[in-house]
């Protein structure tokens, strides 16, 4: 369980997302098919509202293999859909602090 008041902002949010999503990369807003990119993004949800690891997972660019329904092909996103590649921001020490807080 996580504390309802837990938030992640700034570089800490970027670093934590980087670890959670790994080489899948991530979006700062979920794909438009699920939620409006403009109306609700991860900054609003995780920084100003509250955040947990499950919510962070929903912003990863591609579903984790273990989570995919084998009967359904993975969502194909447009080539130009913004995505953050692994290694651009991440530093392990910051992720460690952040995920430990989210897991409490």
């Amino acid at each position: 369980a996580y504390r309802p008041s837990e938030t992640l902002c700034g570089g800490e949010l970027v670093d934590t997302l980087q670890f959670v999503c790994g080489d899948r990369g991530f979006y700062f807003s979920r794909p438009a098919s699920r939620v409006s990119r403009r109306s609700r993004g991860i900054v609003e949800e995780c920084c100003f509202r509250s955040c947990d690891l499950a919510l962070l997972e929903t912003y990863c660019a591609t579903p984790a293999k273990s989570e995919r329904d084998v009967s359904t092909p993975p969502t194909v996103l447009p080539d130009n859909f913004p995505r953050y590649p692994v290694g651009k921001f991440f530093q392990y020490d910051t992720w460690k602090q952040s995920t430990q807080r989210l897991r409490r």
Epitope: C9, G10, G41, V43, Q91
Partner: antibody, heavy 126, light 107 residues
């Protein structure tokens, strides 16, 4: 021209109220998180409050929680700071600052302040 | 909250000197650090962001380095326009916090 211009400062007695305004121009105000940062005379910089780009979601430093309210009117490109129950220690120059920066795809990736107003002086004294 | 500590508080230097200012964070902030310059009666001006990225229009004599908890701002050859107060700021997590400032004055 890209700029921020604060107004509304002045002399107020302890316990009094003031409302600061910050008029933005030269950029798409509604797409940026905005903040207030203050500086007491002869002292360093202190972050006071931030507000999400669309408004509604806010952050405050502990010393002003319950007394200050940050808000914005995106239709007027204006940021506000309502300051109530003012104390002597609130005396400072108040700057508005533009924060959260976007990459070429329009996604937020950074939170530094690249644009500051000139500041407005708030003096709390009897 | 993350505490930011700058050293020295005051630095006396001459035009042409190489100047280094240190900023330490009370916990790791990765590279989420900015440096600002402020002159008396003026608003702060962004110099460096993400610890080492030079803001557009800022002279190349300014540079930043470091990650984790220790950061430095270096002015390779001090110019008359550089006498000012310099602040570091972390934006790793709220509340955003600043160092107490380093005043660079004429020796």
């Amino acid at each position: 021209e890209v700029q921020l211009l604060e107004s509304g400062g002045g002399l107020v007695q302890p316990g009094g109220s003031l409302r600061l305004s910050c008029a933005a121009s030269g950029f798409t105000f509604s797409e940026y998180e905005m903040s207030w940062v203050r500086q007491a005379p002869g002292k360093g910089l202190e972050w006071v409050s931030s507000i999400y780009s669309s408004g509604g979601w806010t952050k405050y430093t502990d010393s002003v929680k319950g007394r200050f309210t940050i808000s914005r009117d995106n239709s007027k490109n204006t940021l506000y700071l309502q300051m109530n129950s003012l104390r002597a220690e609130d005396t400072a120059v108040y700057y508005c600052a533009k924060g959260v920066h976007y990459d070429s795809s329009g996604l937020p990736i950074d939170w530094y302040f690249d644009l500051w107003g000139r500041g407005t002086l708030v003096t709390v004294s009897s | 909250d993350i505490q930011m500590t700058q050293s020295p508080s005051t630095l006396s230097a001459s035009v042409g000197d190489r100047v280094t200012i240190t900023c330490r964070a009370s916990q790791s902030i990765s590279s989420w650090l900015a440096w600002y310059q402020q002159k008396p009666g003026k608003a702060p001006k962004l110099l460096i962001y993400k610890a080492s990225s030079l803001e557009s229009g800022v002279p190349s004599r300014f540079s930043g380095s470091g990650s984790g908890t220790e950061f430095t701002l270096t002015i390779s050859s001090l110019q008359p326009d550089d006498f000012a107060t310099y602040y570091c700021q972390q934006y790793n997590s709220y509340p955003w916090t600043f160092g107490q400032g380093t005043k660079v004055e004429i020796k």
